[in-house]
């Protein structure tokens, strides 16, 4: 493949409040002492604040030349590499009802490509060969997605669609709206 890469910069993905479902209505009662306002927690946060910064899904920007055999792109292309940790749902904003945080182990999230973009590149070849046009598939954004037993490692569930299984004897929670499906696979020259 022979890609040359030069690291440019990094962007940290910090999920917005709007990415997560609203607190389920059955938790908003006297028993919880309005804990729903605090993400299901008492007013003070029962986890070390350093934990939040421990987890971040970063978009590292790389500039690369696309090669195809002896041919190389006239200009470098910039794409993202997803890196970093995705924390437990409980540590993320407004995550109440999304998981059973009191368990010692829970859903595993990974920072992986979310969207891709197609870019047409012109490859210059040695020996007076005519330039070739190629369409390459590049990572456009990263996202925390859940590893799930119903999928292969490569097929991951959107973080925003994960919903806790209803507890025994309780009304099932409405599942969050499904995120937009990834763009169709684009032709990958490399």
């Amino acid at each position: 493949q022979g890609w040359q890469a030069f690291k440019n910069d990094a962007t940290e993905i910090i999920p917005e409040l709007g990415e997560y479902p609203e607190p389920p209505p059955e938790l908003e009662n006297n028993k919880t002492m309005n804990r729903a306002e605090n993400g299901g927690r008492p007013p003070h946060h029962p986890f070390e604040t350093k934990d939040v910064s421990e987890y971040s899904c970063r978009e590292l920007h790389f500039t690369r030349y696309v090669t195809d055999g002896p041919c190389r792109s006239a200009k470098p292309v910039t794409e993202l590499v997803c890196s970093g940790q995705c924390g437990p749902a409980r540590l993320l904003p407004n995550a109440i009802g999304r998981g059973k945080w009191w368990r010692p182990s829970g859903p595993d999230f990974r920072c992986i490509p979310d969207r891709y973009r197609a870019q047409r590149v012109q490859l210059l070849c040695p020996g007076g060969e005519a330039p070739r046009a190629r369409k390459v598939r590049l990572v456009a954004s990263c996202k925390c997605k859940r590893l799930t037993r119903f999928h292969n490692q490569s097929e991951l569930k959107d973080f925003g669609t994960e919903a806790a299984r209803p507890q025994k004897g309780r009304k099932p929670r409405p599942r969050a709206r499904s995120a937009k499906a990834n763009q169709a696979e684009l032709e990958n020259a490399y």
């Epitope: 919880t32 029962p46 986890f47 934990d51 368990r103 037993r149 309780r170």
Partner: antibody
Amino acid sequence: EVQLVESGGGLVQPGRSLRLSCAASGFTFEDYALHWVRQAPGKGLEWVSGIGWDDDMIDYADSVKGRFTISRDNAKNSLYLQMNSLRVEDTALYYCAGNNRGYGGLDVWGQGTTVTVSS
Amino acid sequence: QSVLTQPPSASGTPGQRVTISCSGSSSNIGSNTVNWYQQLPGTAPKLLIYNNNQRPSGVPDRFSGSKSGTSASLAISGLQSEDEADYYCAAWDDSLDSYVFGGGTKLTVL
């Protein structure tokens, strides 16, 4: 100093009941989810039950479901395990453990209390 | 028999690097985070690694965790005599609806 101290263990006959207690100190009790983990003599660890800060945040291992009941009293900084219909295979060292980091493992442990079920 | 499979024993000499494996299935390690515990002889277990590869404060960086597919591993570099202990992996199992432990690995420092 963060501390969990178990008590209530002892020798009991099969079919009888026992209540274990775990007293917590050195941390804000309400902040922690609490669990019971047991270890039979010469064997590995076995998770028994866990509780968040509300009664609807409870889990049990299949081996104790319907026989054991976990509860907590935040006012008394205490965790309990009511064990009914005890069996010989329930003989073990019972640890009280806690976690306050979501899905972050059991980061606080007591020293354990021994339960022996024998006729 | 434990839901998570660990080798019953492992050994190494001081300064060496030792790896302990933990094999599970899609319903536990395959979809949930893995924790590792150390139990020194005659003492209560201690959390060593959480969320697959995170170390609680106070745990030396000689200890590291990793996970791939339905398996996890604990690596101990620069082995020391005080590392002689039983090591357990653990993860939530969605099928059993329980927190499951591996059978434990007894590490001997030769």
